[in-house]
Interface confidence: medium
């Protein structure tokens, strides 16, 4: 049997799990969190290659979440919006994993303390954290061969605080994913 996600062994660095993060919160339809190849994050009704995630413990109670197919890390902006990045930024892409008694987990940005939600119906630019924490059920996924680790330089989400939010003046310089609020 696999070690259950509630095991304290999984709270220490180096432990790796492959999971689908499933949510059935009343506020949204049932969905699996997926990190798409272009860096958008959404929910899929069914398990998909983009929703198979690698959860790796960085330190006790803190994990990184990597999309196995897309080699993108799940990251969160200070306003709560989620995106998938080719570059792991410890501040934007580290999540505290809180284990609930019923087998569900809650995830919070370690840096900002914001709860992890699937993108809702409102733009996060106007409605940063309208709900309580979303509960995710980690469902086991068979571990395929892992992709090569992502490179250091990567496109970043549009910088809303920038005068050139989509890097239209020049090529991407691999900006930090931190956002001007």
């Amino acid at each position: 049997h696999p070690i259950p996600d509630s095991s304290p062994l999984l709270q220490f660095g180096g432990q790796v799990r492959q999971r689908y993060l499933y949510t059935d919160d009343a506020q949204q339809t049932e969905a699996h969190l997926e990190i798409r190849e272009d860096g958008t994050v959404g929910g899929a009704a069914d398990q998909s290659p983009e929703s198979l995630l690698q959860l790796k413990a960085l330190k006790p109670g803190v994990i990184q979440i990597l999309g196995v197919k897309t080699s993108r890390f799940l990251c969160q902006r200070p306003d709560g919006a989620l995106y998938g990045s080719l570059h792991f930024d410890p501040e934007a892409c580290s999540f505290r994993e809180l284990l609930l008694e019923d087998g569900y987990n809650v995830y919070q940005s370690e840096a900002h303390g914001l709860p992890l939600h699937l993108p809702g119906n409102k733009s996060p630019h106007r409605d940063p954290a309208p709900r309580g924490p979303a509960r995710f059920l980690p469902l086991p996924g068979l571990p395929p061969a892992l992709p090569e680790p992502p490179g250091i330089l990567a496109p970043q989400p549009p910088d809303v605080g920038s005068s050139d939010p989509l890097s239209m003046v020049g090529p991407s310089q691999g900006r930090s994913p931190s956002y001007a609020s």
Epitope: T40, L86, P155, L166, S167
Partner: antibody, heavy 117, light 96 residues
Framework: QVQLQQSGAELARPGASVKLSCKAS????????ISWVKQRTGQGLEWIGE????????YYNEKFKGKATLTADKSSSTAYMELRSLTSEDSAVYFC??????????WGQGTTLTVSS | MSASPGERVTMTCSAG?????MYWYQQKPRSSPKPWIY???NLASGVPARFSGSGSGTSYSLTISSMEAEDAATYYC?????????FGGGTKVEIK
């Protein structure tokens, strides 16, 4: 600056195949997706599919599966779309566009395909 | 739709099911589409401040606060909360 340079206009016979190209410059080709979009004269935009050169993963609109095949050559930073079994319905302008976080942020100038006997 | 200079113009885009964000593009005849609004409400580089975007769920809109001649174009909305990415049919805005 970012540019997507598409191949020139094509005239093809019904039943034939054609391969359109889109050469990218001004950015790291493997860090973004390339989508292809169809626009018939006087009509709207229709997403055909997308390729991610870093992984060669492709995603298609179900409607264009079997019609379009997307490939990419990392060494030349060029994306290709092959259209097969051409009919008059395939006559259109085809755009390639760069995909960034769900948004098509740069577009090629378009390639006009005319299918006629 | 047709609008006089200085008039406020609002065009809407209705999704078949709830989507997280909407994106908008402007296209003029014989030209490629241009990125216009991303993540529902953010203006792409170079887009005049008279444009704005809003909406949530299945209902989104693009507004021109004060119509100018150069705004005459067709505007397309686009989503990718689900596959395939889909564009709206486009709204043609003309100047009176």
């Amino acid at each position: 600056q970012v540019q997507l340079q598409q191949s020139g206009a094509e005239l093809a016979r019904p039943g034939a195949s054609v391969k359109l190209s889109c050469k990218a410059s001004g950015y790291t080709f493997t860090n973004y997706g390339i989508s292809w979009v169809k626009q018939r004269t006087g009509q709207g935009l229709e997403w055909i599919g997308e390729i991610y050169p870093r992984s060669d993963n492709t995603y298609y609109n179900e409607k264009f599966k079997g019609k379009a095949t997307l490939t990419a050559d990392k060494s030349s930073s060029t994306a290709y779309m092959e259209l097969r079994s051409l009919t008059s319905e395939d006559s259109a302008v085809y755009f390639c566009t760069r995909s960034d976080y769900g948004f098509f942020d740069y577009w090629g100038q378009g390639t006009t395909l005319t299918v006629s006997s | 739709m047709s609008a006089s200079p200085g008039e406020r113009v609002t065009m809407t885009c209705s999704a078949g099911s709830s989507v997280s964000y909407m994106y908008w593009y402007q296209q003029k005849p014989r030209s490629s589409p241009k990125p216009w609004i991303y993540l529902t409400s953010n203006l792409a580089s170079g887009v005049p401040a008279r444009f704005s975007g809003s909406g949530s769920g299945t209902s989104y809109s693009l507004t021109i606060s004060s119509m100018e001649a150069e705004d005459a174009a067709t505007y397309y909305c686009q989503q990718w909360s689900s596959n395939p990415r889909t564009f709206g049919g486009g709204t043609k805005v003309e100047i009176k």
